[in-house]
Amino acid sequence: MRTEAQVPALQPPEPGLEGAMGHRTLVLPWVLLTLCVTAGTPEVWVQVRMEATELSSFTIRCGFLGSGSISLVTVSWGGPNGAGGTTLAVLHPERGIRQWAPARQARWETQSSISLILEGSGASSPCANTTFCCKFASFPEGSWEACGSLPPSSDPGLSAPPTPAPILRADLAGILGVSGVLLFGCVYLLHLLRRHKHRPAPRLQPSRTSPQAPRARAWAPSQASQAALHVPYATINTSCRPATLDTAHPHGGPSWWASLPTHAAHRPQGPAAWASTPIPARGSFVSVENGLYAQAGERPPHTGPGLTLFPDPRGPRAMEGPLGVR
């Protein structure tokens, strides 16, 4: 069962005694306001569930709520992938999937969500307060990340509700594309609101699920108003992040299309049909400069063919053969 976090609906003030024309002029600002707040505001949700049957087994599900085309998904644990986290799986819509122990099976669930089953014991076993992060790279929105973990009091078999992603940063591709239009709309909106100064402007209230959580930093100017609508959850620092990570043994994963939901309306015509597949995102209120993996010169040293230490915050990297888990 999944309960989605609700975003409170914005209610415009009553038009009062204004005439039809006045009412009509007020409709446009609210339409624009809704656009300013919602358009170009992709979200990443993260759901972590501990299996009732196996206490050391976790299922992480991540989804991308945006209209863009997904280019890559990265799932990490122990924190954001670029900030101390260790990569568990990387998924590309055409080139495939690669995963590392204790990840057992990473797969696309839909065109915009993925799931990852983790299991293990000992050093590589996840524990209840582990933080899992998902990063989605998409066009035109850019890179979006969010993290989630099981609440300390979670009963096995229950899942943490999906966590909406905080607004961290959209890459220039998303900013330039959507924000120009939005900026114009928002400026016009402010202009219209100014003309109705006698009417108090409505206050945008963030979701009240975690009122004391620090607010996500808005990296893009166009997101200033968006950030006010989302309060990130507090990320729990994990004390059981593994020091070592075994290289995942190659195994045959499910066929590419097998991960389509049974209710899918149509079978995609080819890998490109996965254009909106999601990409896991980074930490909630951790301010992450999005270097798009481009920091050069650092790679995890290898201690042997089967055992790898990952002091590098970006963790292990891996590749998949086309359309499958290698």
Epitope: S69, L72, R95, G96, G174, Y293, A294, R299, R317
Partner: antibody, heavy 122, light 107 residues
């Protein structure tokens, strides 16, 4: 089929600039990066830099920093590589190749463009 | 930068021979290594990715192995159409670097 088609050969004078285009077809352009590699006559392959089509983010070889600019036009699925302040040792065949949207994962180059010969001569 | 040392720089073998090319990385690159074939006047073509995975459509006589710093590329039975220069390429770190190439000729 997946294809990269590059612009034609260029002859330039030292100090000039050249802009090579690379038009992609047969795949979702923004799912990948475009990587630029050059090959001087009789020499090996040299990575020049790359651009991630979904974001426009770039990485350039240190020796070319400040002289090279890589861009994309997602509406036409075309990548561009501009090299300025040309010198005689920039004479080479310039290739574009399809690679990953992150250099760290899934990053093999396939396919390659047919190459564009740029000759720098006074 | 990670240096890729490819050897030999050239070799001559008979049709049907087993040909082996090695590539050594100056630092650990796990299996982030690809092999390409380039024929004169043509663009390179991908043969092997991630050290050992055979690219779609590539004949099975080509194979790759290795991990960490030492990699091997093998043509199990050399064919006349295999006359080309072969390059290894790493992407374990930026900058992406290529080996110097191995020119394969027929005796």
């Amino acid at each position: 089929q997946v294809q990269l088609v590059q612009s034609g050969a260029e002859v330039k004078k030292p100090g000039a600039s050249v802009k090579v285009s690379c038009k992609a077809s047969g795949y979702t352009f923004t799912h990948y990066g475009i990587y630029w590699v050059r090959q001087a006559p009789g020499q090996g392959l040299e990575w020049m830099g790359h651009i991630y089509a979904y974001s426009g983010d770039t990485d350039y070889a240190q020796k070319l920093q400040g002289r090279v600019t890589m861009t994309t036009d997602t509406s036409t699925s075309t990548a561009y590589m501009e090299l300025r302040s040309l010198r005689s040792d920039d004479t080479a065949v310039y290739y574009c190749a399809r690679g990953s949207p992150t250099y760290e994962h899934f990053n093999w180059f396939d396919p390659w463009g047919q190459g564009t010969l740029v000759t720098v001569s006074s | 930068d990670i240096q890729m040392t490819q050897s030999p720089s050239s070799l001559s073998a008979s049709v049907g021979d087993r040909v082996t090319i090695t590539c050594q990385a100056s630092d650990d690159i796990s299996d982030y290594l690809n092999w390409y074939q380039q024929k004169p006047g043509k663009a390179p073509k991908l043969l092997i990715y991630d050290a050992s995975s055979l690219h779609t459509g590539v004949p099975s006589r080509f194979s790759g192995s290795g991990s960490g710093t030492d990699f091997t590329f093998t043509i199990s039975s050399l064919q006349p159409e295999d006359i080309a220069t072969y390059y290894c390429q790493q992407y374990g770190n930026l900058p992406i670097t290529f080996g110097g190439g191995t020119k394969v000729e027929i005796k």
